[in-house]
Interface confidence: low
């Protein structure tokens, strides 16, 4: 279920799957929610630790049991991912942090009159992930009212420093507030060039596009279909970026599909989940559990309820069925995508709906057990 | 909202505008989306106008002037007014609206979390009231959704300011001693929300107050935590299962 409580002065021991710098616990929790394996997180505010390297540290954690031992650490904040929390799942983060400088690659500097205007500029710049703004009272006069637009390889700051009269924040593109607008078109038989930032396996171009939309550095993508001539590249989704923000070239190519991230769409973003079920397809991955259920929809529900499950395969092979129930294979991987996709099988596959924000399974408060 | 500022897109995605279409169409009250098919508002919004088919509920909007005849709206399937609400009193000023069709959630249209039943221990320090209501006592409905940060006031303090009315434990008050910031006419039914541990909760429903933003006259709100049993009972009996974001 959905667990929203935060634990003050507590730090989860072990289970680390990733670490980064974030300005507060809520942003750390959001990164945990969107990380394919993160179930728990711990955050170290600047006040909680003397080690400059660990200040603002956000530690994403996984656990087979869904929990980890808590150790007392003054000032630390820990909590759960919001993976099963329905409408609370959002990559939108509006807060502005005063007295904090979020470091990254500064690619644009301009003079603006307010931090809100700086945030707007970041939101309206295709490459900007976060920003810092030097206020009117900044100690160096020549930097006052400077708006620095930034990006980093992981989409989070490479460091966070306490600095007076500086305010920082994130792009509001995930809030669907970008003025850039987006290309909804999918281009059949076209491959984009430029830099690959990641490679995942997906069953179709639409899943590829959604993954691109929620990847911090993906601006466009190319997907190789299951009939692509090179077998090892079938169902490969290449997430791409470029200096200009658009593909520098595109090549006509049979059995490829290309398109753009939808992060810059106005008013609507795709949900960060994939609800379609793929008949005759087997998703490979690490086995989490196998259970007998009645129907592929129940299999998907079972996967959704098991928080670590990322995708599933429902087998219809006679040896995998007992009366009306068949085997539901609950699976996971390092990146949340299948490690292999096989066609022509007797069964169906799909993804967990744990990141769908329309779920009614969500609650907003701490779970309390009845006596 | 008196003393407020413009909101931005998606800042308060649970805020809805309750409008009546008679000869003309106008905004009457606010409300809060609490589930795909449920809106929580003030009972007094329906005083004299309990006809379901004249109401139009607009969600996912920021600017009332953007509403055209083509703007999608929700219609009411059922109005559930608290059984103990009386027109002449301030008590039990709470109502549920069941929409005819469920709404999809987006960044601009999603529900607000409800508090735990009888939530008395949480100390809320970051509370906001939102609405399209008057910006001064004899003002007019605002186009852009307004927001204002207002501190909660203890019921004892509130009772001192309203000696002619009973401030019950099922009410919550908010305001500045010096006035200047408050809800006003047309904000009724809208949310008083507080952020706690990074999460917004619906603490109150805008109900009443002496004038607007007057010195030592806080706004009075229906305390949602006190009505959690009622909300759950009504939404579950109507649906078979709870359709709003509430404690497990």
């Amino acid at each position: 279920g959905c667990l929203t409580q935060l634990y003050e002065n507590a730090f989860f021991r072990g289970g680390d799957v990733a670490s980064m710098y974030t300005p507060n616990a809520q942003y750390c929790q959001m990164r945990c929610t969107f990380h394919p394996r993160c179930l728990l997180f711990s955050f170290l505010p600047a006040s909680s630790i003397n080690d400059m390297e660990k200040r603002f540290g956000c530690f994403l954690k996984d656990s087979v049991t869904g929990t980890l031992p808590k150790v007392h650490r003054t000032g630390a904040v820990s909590g759960h991912s919001l993976k099963q929390c329905g409408h609370q799942i959002s990559a939108c983060h509006r807060d502005i942090y005063k007295g904090v400088d979020m470091r990254g690659v500064n690619f644009n500097v301009s003079k603006v009159s307010s931090v809100e205007e700086c945030q707007k500029r970041c939101t309206s710049n295709i490459r900007c992930q976060f920003f810092s703004y030097a206020t009117q009272t900044f100690h160096k006069a020549e930097y006052r009212n400077n708006c620095l637009l930034k990006y980093s390889p992981g989409g989070t700051p490479t460091a966070i420093k306490v600095l007076s009269n500086v305010e920082s924040g994130f792009s509001l593109k995930p809030c669907a507030l970008s003025e850039i607008g987006c290309h909804m078109n999918i281009f059949q038989h076209l491959a984009f060039s430029d830099v690959d930032v990641a490679r995942v396996l997906t069953p179709d171009a639409f899943v590829c596009r959604t993954i691109c939309t929620y990847h911090p550095n993906c601006l466009f993508f190319t997907f190789y279909t299951n009939v692509w001539k090179i077998e090892s590249q079938r169902n490969v989704c290449l997430l791409k970026t470029s200096e200009s923000g658009t593909p520098s070239s595109s090549t006509p190519q049979e059995n490829t599909i290309s398109g753009y991230s939808l992060l810059t769409c106005k008013r609507t973003l795709p949900e960060p989940c994939h609800s379609k079920i793929y008949p005759g397809v087997d998703f490979g991955g690490e086995e989490l559990n196998v259970t007998f259920v009645k129907g592929v929809n129940v299999c998907q529900e079972t996967c959704t309820k098991m928080i670590r499950c990322q995708f599933f395969t429902y087998s219809l092979l006679p040896e995998d069925c007992k009366e009306e129930k068949c085997k539901c294979f609950l699976r996971l991987s390092m990146d949340g995508s299948p490690t292999r996709i096989a066609y022509g099988t007797q069964g169906s596959s799909g993804y967990s709906l744990r990141l769908c924000n329309t779920g009614d399974n969500s609650v907003c408060t701490t779970k309390t057990s009845t006596r | 909202i008196v003393g407020g500022t413009n909101s931005s897109w998606g800042e308060w995605p649970w805020q809805v505008s309750l409008q009546v279409k008679l000869t003309a169409q106008r905004h009457l009250c606010g409300g809060s989306l609490i589930g795909h098919q449920w809106v929580l508002t003030a009972a007094h919004c329906f005083d004299g106008l309990p006809l379901q088919d004249v109401w139009r509920i607009y969600s996912g909007i920021l600017n009332l002037s953007d509403i055209t005849k083509d703007t999608p709206f929700s219609q009411i399937k059922e109005i559930i007014i608290h059984q103990n609400y009386k027109v002449s009193e301030g008590n039990h000023d709470i109502a549920l609206i069941k929409l005819q069709a469920p709404l999809n959630y987006t960044e601009f249209q999603k529900p607000i979390c409800l508090p735990s039943k009888g939530d008395t221990s949480t100390i809320y320090t970051n509370c906001w009231v939102t609405g399209w209501g008057f910006s001064k006592e004899k003002g007019e409905i605002q186009n852009i959704l307004q927001k204002v940060n207002i501190p909660l006031v203890t019921n004892e303090e509130c009772q001192k300011r309203y000696q002619d009315y009973k401030i019950t434990q099922r009410m919550v008050c908010a305001g500045y001693k010096e006035g200047g910031k408050d809800a006003c006419k047309g904000d009724s039914g809208g949310p008083l929300v507080c952020k706690h541990n990074g999460m917004w909760r619906l603490v109150g429903i805008t109900s009443w107050g002496e004038g607007c933003a007057r010195r030592e006259q806080p706004g009075v709100y229906t305390k949602v935590a006190e009505y959690m049993d009622w909300i759950l009972e009504k939404t579950q009996s109507s649906d078979g299962k709870a359709q709003m974001q509430s404690p497990a």
């Epitope: - | 007094h44 009193e89 009724s188 009075v220």
Partner: antibody, heavy 122, light 106 residues
């Protein structure tokens, strides 16, 4: 802008009838207690009749009970006063007004129209 | 029915004077009392409600006090614009007006 506009006044003979209207605009008419108040030439204000928001409850001053009927059409934002068996002492400027009830709601305040003159004379 | 008795019925005063008008209810009306100002040929204008709460936009020289059966309207320093007739009104049980107090130039 909030407005109340009375109409229907005029000269009528004793025993005659008249129907006053009050057109409301700029506020949520259906939410308010509406009332009629009159003022005889050179005299004070006298409350005549009131009607609650839904129209289900109507109240009258003793001086007009049984002769006057107050009603409202919320769909037309209009208040009415049907005056039958008129007497010379009913001669007055008739104002429509609305005012708060119970707790001061976030949508209640006090407004008067400019009045319409009714003269009952043979 | 609740009767409202206002006194005096006429009051002569000069600009700058402090003026007090009283209103007595035939039974307790708590604080459910309003004061209105009316100028010839015009509709009444609300000054004070709930006995002592100043209506928005009304000058602070006007104040109200009292509860139960005895109420007072005070104008701390009479201005030329204040020469008019003043009415009290109870709204505890339906509505009743006092007979009015005319404030005229001395």
């Amino acid at each position: 802008e909030v407005q109340l506009l009375e109409s229907g006044g005029g000269l009528v003979q004793p025993g005659g009838s008249l129907r006053l209207s009050c057109a409301a605009s700029g506020f949520t008419f259906s939410h308010y207690i509406m009332m009629w108040v009159r003022q005889a030439p050179g005299k004070g204000l006298e409350w005549v009749s009131g009607i609650y928001s839904s129209g289900g409850i109507t109240v009258y001053a003793d001086s007009v009970k049984g002769r006057f009927t107050i009603s409202r059409d919320n769909s037309k934002n209009t208040l009415y006063l049907q005056m039958n068996s008129l007497r010379a002492e009913d001669t007055a400027v008739y104002y429509c007004a609305y005012r708060r009830i119970g707790v001061p709601r976030r949508d209640s305040f006090d407004i008067w129209g400019q009045g319409t003159m009714v003269t009952v004379s043979s | 029915d609740i009767q409202m008795t206002q006194s005096p019925s006429t009051l002569s005063a000069s600009v700058g004077d402090r003026v007090t008008i009283t209103c007595r209810a035939s039974q307790s009306i708590s604080s459910w009392l309003a004061w209105y100002q009316q100028k010839p040929g015009k509709a009444p204008n609300l000054l004070i409600y709930k006995a002592s709460t100043l209506e928005s936009g009304v000058p602070s020289r006007f104040s109200g006090s009292g509860s139960g059966t005895e109420f007072t309207l005070t104008i701390s320093s009479l201005q030329p614009d204040d020469f008019a007739t003043y009415y009290c009104q109870q709204y505890n049980t339906y509505w009743t007006f006092g007979q009015g107090t005319k404030v005229e130039i001395k």
